[in-house]
């Protein structure tokens, strides 16, 4: 799986959109989890409605939400007031019994608002590869590493 | 029981090269990402680089480029690590490390560090 | 390369004393922040991880704190075992880099 950058600024939301073969995932409940590194285990966050019909139904856990647009084959989670905790690995999961395809590998990363001026001089806006070798930037909001690609970041 | 455990001491003379092994047990190095870490006496820590052993990619800090070289077999869940054109400022410990990689990795294991001198 | 820039280098404290490490980093690092304890002749040991998260098995005296640029490693009651080398070291891009290190010695 590629990794999609999607980058929001502290404060605010920023929406993640995972898409998937509709008819291939047809009747599967989907999750979003929090993987602890690179290489780390997925914690789950928020999975959708136990209802496979009410997918379309957002469900809340604290501040992540989520919503499933079965027919169009479309995740959408939500993160409210983005945090720098915020920051890290994730990944859009479709559930078969214990089992979890992978959807998207995400990796969420939290620029700091420009409006806050709390200490200008700490203002970061990340340069086109500055996280990632060679990465491609797709305007702003999200990017994709290609395949094998590692983070460059990636301690613990 | 999980732990790293490194080769022995090593004395070399300037110009020669060396190779420190770092073998895993309790867990299987392709779930992880094998680092090496050096510290000269009485100094402070210093990354030297790191090896994805699942995929066989390595990277070096900039210093090392070229003179180091980090490889892995993961038949014998073994790391290793060569320092070629060893100079008298290359004594130091040794450490190998694994950890799931940045971004909040909650593993982390260290070796117990091997000492190379290097003296002529 | 990132720089870390701990400080003080040293510090001398006596046991119950609360202790604050800071480090800055010379770039934006998010919370990729961990900091290390270290004992002479034995490998370094983690603390807290992603900035603020204990790591398994560490007292919850200490605590980490920070983002973006600056870190703070507390201790809120030192206790004898807790003299040693501290370490941060940012995991937001390779190289990793190491603060230079705080020495917590016996006041």
């Known amino acids: 799986h590629n990794t999609t950058v999607f980058q929001g600024v502290e404060g605010q939301s920023l929406q993640v959109s995972c898409p998937y073969d509709s008819m291939k995932h047809w009747g599967r409940r989907k999750a979003w989890c929090r993987q602890l590194g690179e290489k780390g285990p997925c914690q789950r966050v928020v999975s959708t409605h136990n209802l496979w019909l009410l997918s379309f139904l957002r469900r809340r856990n604290g501040s992540t939400a989520i919503t499933d647009d079965t027919l169009g084959g479309t995740l959408t989670i939500t993160l409210r007031n983005l945090q720098p905790h915020d920051a890290g690995f994730y990944q859009c999961q479709s559930l078969h019994g214990s089992e979890a395809d992978t959807l998207r590998k995400v990796l969420v990363e939290v620029l700091a608002d420009p409006l806050d001026h709390r200490d200008a001089g700490d203002l970061w806006v990340p340069g086109e590869s500055e996280s990632f070798e060679d990465a491609h930037v797709e305007h702003s909001i999200s990017r994709s590493l290609l395949e094998g690609e590692i983070p460059f970041p990636p301690t613990s | 029981q999980v732990q790293l455990v490194q080769s022995g001491a090593e004395v070399k003379k300037p110009g020669a090269s060396v190779k420190v092994s770092c073998k895993a047990s309790g867990f299987s190095i392709e779930d992880f990402y094998i680092h090496w870490v050096r510290q000269a006496p009485g100094q402070g820590l210093e990354w030297m680089g790191w090896i994805d052993p699942e995929q066989g990619e390595s990277k070096y800090a900039p210093k090392f480029q070229g003179r180091a070289t980090i490889t892995a077999d993961t038949s014998t869940s073994t790391a290793y690590m060569e320092l070629s054109s060893l100079r008298s400022e290359d004594t130091a410990v040794y450490y190998c490390?694994?950890?799931?990689?940045?971004?909040?990795?909650?593993?982390?294991?260290w070796g117990q560090g091997t000492l190379v001198t290097v003296s002529s | 390369d990132i720089q870390m820039t701990q400080s003080p280098s040293s510090l001398s404290a006596s046991v119950g004393d609360r202790v604050t490490i800071t480090c800055h980093a010379s770039q934006h690092i998010n919370v990729w922040l961990s900091w290390y304890q270290q004992k002479p002749g034995k490998a370094p040991k983690l603390l807290i991880y992603k900035a603020s998260n204990l790591h398994t098995g560490v007292p919850s005296r200490f605590s980490g704190s920070g983002s973006g640029t600056d870190f703070t490693l507390t201790i809120s009651s030192l206790q004898p075992e807790d003299f040693a080398t501290y370490y941060c070291q940012q995991g937001q891009t390779y190289p990793r880099t190491f603060g230079q290190g705080t020495k917590v010695e016996i006041k």
């Open positions: 490390h694994a950890d799931h990689g940045n971004y909040g990795s909650t593993m982390d294991y």
